[in-house]
């Protein structure tokens, strides 16, 4: 069953892990929630921004002036250098975004919004955002997600469980109830048939198709033979015999004309017996006991 | 410059597994962040995510078909590979190799597709 | 698993037209949300990410908005090479879905 989830940068914790909005998919990642790390040759807070170009960048844009910048490159607006949906033109020198509500700033990159406005939900921690010129951050506590923290988590939507165990989310906590044949807190022990199985009393483990079955011994039933069985329950005496259960098995008492363990042999009119004797010491008729 | 490229056979018979392999160029898996997706699409009909892998060996897929996929990388050859058991008729589809970055789970670039045809 | 139901299926209108296409999810997705262009026999492309954030080269005259279950692509002013099937993806949890899409037809 090939589902893996190894306990890395809170995968297995209580919200999925979801970069900041706007965090580029070409050029961005992340390692916390609500974060944008930038691959190598990428920056800015959104990493839009190629390295090699933003040294080239004064507050105005690009500009030749800039020592060490070599990269003409294509039209100011290409690579769309606007974030948060700001639409660019080009000036006669470098570009302008004109940026939409709530965001400003060269490229758009900055949210109106600080923590002083109170954005993180449902007990979310604010940080950053002091004054309007820094963005702010929401710290989502166990249970919630989104850039303000205004989304329950379907904890269960990780796949914590593994091999094929189905996920039951508690509220205080995840539950995986496993298939067959595996154990542990996320399913992920395989008890690889008999391995680690005892069955009790006495009785032999048999494997099969990844779990186990045990093959109990006389007296006793039960997945792992921990139940005393009754051996007259299956009415194991032919012909009317009566079945007493006896500690270390059955005995029947077979009605007159029958003989044997079971009460399964005809006794002859003239006294012999159809198959083999009675055992040494056993009249027919005898109560005879079963091993 | 980067591009993915999907490979794999182009007919297979019912029951059978199909092994696909996405072999791609400008970028590493073993970079931090990294990671390399499968999605398909039948004939006419919408995409569906099927698996994910990352530079860290994390693996997801589909909840629907996740009994049947297994995603696996090889690094050193820039290959991600993903094998489908089982295959059957409504399988058939065109499958796309493409990158996603690690907690930026959308696909910014893909290959141009393999289509694959269940048949007997 | 989050559903997401795009209309119209199809869409028919003249270039220069202005398109509005729709993506509702059956759930919050936060502003999660992609939207991708397909033309025959060519992959998905990549257009919006994030409710509104265009994707690198992407024209100024797609545009992207909505949050939580509600999205909208507007596509200002068709051109003869928008003509395609557009689709939405979530990306707020597991297991990632798309919609069904949204064929773009030349009227």
């Known amino acids: 069953y090939p589902y893996d989830v190894p306990d890395y940068a809170g995968m297995l914790g209580s919200a999925p892990l979801v970069c900041r909005a706007g965090c580029s998919p070409e050029h961005g990642f992340c390692e916390q929630p609500g974060e944008c790390r930038c691959l190598e040759g990428w920056t800015g807070p959104l990493c839009t921004v190629p390295v090699s170009t933003s040294s080239c960048l004064s507050p105005r844009g690009p500009s030749s002036a800039t020592t060490g910048c070599l990269v003409p490159g294509p039209g100011p607006c290409d690579g769309n250098p606007c974030a948060n949906g700001g639409s660019c033109s080009e000036t006669p020198r470098s570009f302008e975004c004109t940026c939409p509500r709530g965001f400003y700033g060269l490229r758009c990159e900055v949210s109106g919004v600080t923590c002083a406005d109170g954005p993180c939900f449902n007990g979310g921690l604010c940080v950053g955002g002091a004054d309007p010129d820094s963005a702010y951050i929401c710290h989502c506590p166990p249970g919630f997600q989104g850039s303000n923290c205004e989304k329950r988590v379907d904890r269960c939507s990780l796949q914590p469980c593994r091999n094929g165990g189905l996920c039951l989310d508690l509220g205080h906590a995840l539950r995986c109830r496993c298939r067959a044949g595996f154990a542990g807190p996320r399913c992920e022990h395989d008890l690889d048939d008999c391995a680690g199985r005892a069955c009790a009393n006495g009785g032999t483990c048999v494997e099969g198709g990844g779990a186990h079955r045990c093959s109990c011994a006389l007296g006793f039933g039960g997945r792992d033979c921990r139940e005393r069985a009754d051996p007259c329950a299956a009415r194991p005496c032919a012909h009317g015999g009566r079945c007493y259960a006896h500690f270390s098995g059955l005995v029947c008492a077979c009605a007159p004309g029958y003989m044997g363990a079971r009460c399964e042999f005809p006794v002859h009119p003239d006294g012999a017996s159809a198959l083999p004797a009675a055992p040494p010491g056993l009249r027919p008729g005898d109560p005879q006991r079963y091993l | 410059q980067i591009t993915l490229k999907e490979s794999g056979p182009t007919l297979v018979k019912p029951t059978q597994t199909l092994t696909l392999t996405c072999t791609f160029s400008g970028f590493s898996l073993s970079t931090r962040g990294v990671g390399v997706g499968w999605i398909r699409q039948p004939p006419g009909k919408a995409l569906e995510w099927l698996a994910l892998?990352?530079?860290?060996?994390?693996?997801r897929y589909s909840p629907s078909l996740q009994t049947r996929l297994t995603i696996t990388k090889d690094t050193p050859k820039n290959q991600v590979v993903l094998t489908m058991t089982n295959m059957d008729p409504v399988d058939t589809a065109t499958y796309y190799c493409a990158r996603s970055n690690w907690g930026n789970w959308y696909f910014a670039l893909w290959g141009r597709g393999t289509l694959v045809t269940v048949s007997s | 698993e989050i559903v997401l139901t795009q209309s119209p299926a199809t869409l028919s209108l003249s270039p220069g037209e202005r398109a509005t296409l729709s993506c509702r999810a059956s759930?919050?997705?936060?502003?999660?949300l992609a939207w991708y262009q397909q033309k025959p026999g060519q992959a998905p492309r990549l257009l919006i990410y994030?409710?509104?954030y265009r994707a690198t080269g992407i024209p100024a005259r797609f545009s992207g908005s909505g949050s939580g279950t509600d999205f909208t692509l507007t596509i200002s002013s068709l051109e003869p090479e928008d003509f395609a099937v557009y689709y939405c993806q979530h990306r707020s949890n597991w297991p990632i879905t798309f919609g069904q899409g949204t064929r773009l037809e030349i009227k």
């Open positions: 759930q919050s997705v936060s502003s999660y």
């Open positions: 994030d409710a509104f």
């Open positions: 892998i990352y530079w860290n060996d994390d693996k």
